[in-house]
């Protein structure tokens, strides 16, 4: 069986600046050298890809330049940060981990992190 357990926090509250961070941890069954991490958002039974990065073990995650995600890796743990979030982005963010190389291929899917985003109240007008 090529099952792989992926753990992530159940709930995270985004900061007032629309930034949310969480850890995605996977129980690697083998000695993978190439790992792909994908963040997917599930809302209203629709699944969309938020961002994805492939990295070599021991190296940094590299997301596309226009990605809203950044991250670092340490062993079997990936620290993910999603920025630019608004209230409408509230939803379940699922961490998917694929061990790409060497074979065999493994796939693990977390249960998801519910990210709550609250848009900040606009500052009241001031005479000063």
């Amino acid at each position: 069986c090529k099952a792989m357990h992926v753990a992530q926090p159940a709930v995270v509250l985004a900061s007032s600046r629309g930034i949310a961070s969480f850890v995605c941890e996977y129980a690697s069954p083998g000695k993978a050298t190439e790992v792909r991490v994908t963040v997917l958002r599930q809302a209203d039974s629709q699944v969309t890809e938020v961002c994805a990065a492939t990295y070599m073990m021991g190296n940094e995650l590299t997301f596309l330049d226009d990605s809203i995600c950044t991250g670092t890796s340490s062993g079997n743990q990936v620290n993910l940060t999603i920025q630019g979030l608004r209230a409408m982005d509230t939803g379940l963010y699922i961490c998917k981990v694929e061990l790409m190389y060497p074979p065999p291929y493994y796939l693990g899917i977390g249960n998801g992190t519910q990210i709550y985003v609250i848009d900040p109240e606009p500052c009241p007008d001031s005479d000063f």
Partner: nanobody
Amino acid sequence: EVQLVESGGGLVQPAGSLRLSCADSGSIFSINTMGWYRQAPGKQRELVATITSSGSTNYADSVKGRFTISRDNAKNTVYLQMNSLKPEDTAVYYCNADYRDFGLSMERFIDFGSWGQGTQVTVSS
């Protein structure tokens, strides 16, 4: 990135034949079991045939005796020979690993697995 590329679909008359191919340019093929899935309009995706790395095959009752799955391990390719096609075989066909290999439900694998674009098979006179 997992890259599964399905081809070989098309329009065929009832009782006709088609041969689908699926090439894997990534590493998923090294998994023991590969399968062909299909999704008809308005219906759930279903697994119709699987093949292990050693060549053992399994089929859904609806295609038994008509479809044959095979694989070429050297080319990282899996095939589906479809004979005696029926209008109810009309669907988009996808190849992927057997979802059970990952300890996932079919629904979860459909939602979160890595899928190719599929190839359309239309059986109509």
